[in-house]
């Protein structure tokens, strides 16, 4: 009889341990769900506020036609400048026309004055051809004035109303570009 009671007690204890384990798993699952819910809510909130503001460009970016531009407040070498732009979902400035060049240089005059700003232009070491980062060639009127006698890689930058070239490892400000959001209204 005593052995029977002891067996039942052990079975009950085993059951209790299993239930505690299940409860622990459930609590962990609940916590994980709550955490995911938090992420979801934050994401939704973000999306909703973006949609509500529906500004074509983010804060501190300048709009011109279909593009948004960010003029950096820090110096960096060309490659780091590119990474900084990518972190914000943009690329270094790619100037498509004289009109765009005029807008950029005009805006820079108002904002900062005569400084150097990296753009997304670099010179192929083998062919010597100037190419934008997407692989396209600049239009003839938008080729950098030859100024760099560097043996290192050469990249393009804007200063005043000119497109110039310099060793990519020098420190300059930079300009990022992304597409402006179209208004859905």
């Amino acid at each position: 009889k005593l052995l029977q009671v002891s067996t039942i007690a052990m079975q009950q204890q085993e059951k209790l341990i299993q239930q505690e384990r299940a409860l622990l798993n459930f609590t962990e699952w609940k916590r994980s769900c709550a955490l995911q819910m938090k992420y979801c809510q934050a994401f939704m909130q973000n999306s909703l506020s973006s949609a509500h503001n529906s500004s074509p460009c983010p804060n501190n970016w300048i709009q011109n036609r279909e593009s948004c531009y960010y003029v950096s407040e820090i110096w960096s070498i060309w490659h780091t400048s590119q990474e900084n732009c990518l972190k914000e979902g943009s690329t270094l400035l790619q100037i498509e026309s004289k009109e765009e060049m005029d807008f950029i240089t005009g805006s820079l005059r108002k904002i900062k004055g005569s400084y150097d700003y990296w753009v997304g232009l670099s010179q192929d070491g083998h062919s010597g051809r100037w190419l934008w980062q997407d692989g396209s060639s600049p239009s003839p009127g938008l080729l950098p004035a030859e100024r760099s006698q560097s043996a290192n890689q050469v990249c393009g930058y804007v200063k005043s109303n000119s497109l110039l070239s310099s060793n990519c490892s020098t420190w300059k400000y930079f300009i990022c570009e992304k597409y402006a959001l179209r208004s859905s209204v």
């Epitope: 992420y39 972190k87 979902g89 690329t91 692989g135 992304k178 597409y179």
Partner: nanobody
Framework: QVQLQESGGGLVQAGESLRLSCVVS????????MGWYRQAPGKQRELVAA???????SYVDSVKGRFTISRDNAANTVYLQMNSLKPEDTAVYYC?????????WGQGTQVTVSS
Amino acid sequence: QVQLQESGGGLVQAGESLRLSCVVSGRTFSINAMGWYRQAPGKQRELVAAITNQGRLSYVDSVKGRFTISRDNAANTVYLQMNSLKPEDTAVYYCAAFQSSGIDWGQGTQVTVSS
């Protein structure tokens, strides 16, 4: 945190092609752009190609016209199509996710091009 898993590396002859894939998981909504870096022995890691969420592209000079970056948002995958491979393309290729807070890298996949 974003998790990145590369595949598709291997040993090829000069002039041949390879396609690298990178599957992205985790907090993918925080990603603003995706890219591929490479690092050859004794050299610095360099950004080979990148694509923003808007589809803006960027390539290093040495691969322009040979490599193409693309992404499949539905499959959370980024690709690097590498054509006309050269021995100097030999390196470990790393997938990268660009976020405002920084850059996350995968573990890398080895690409070896023999002459």
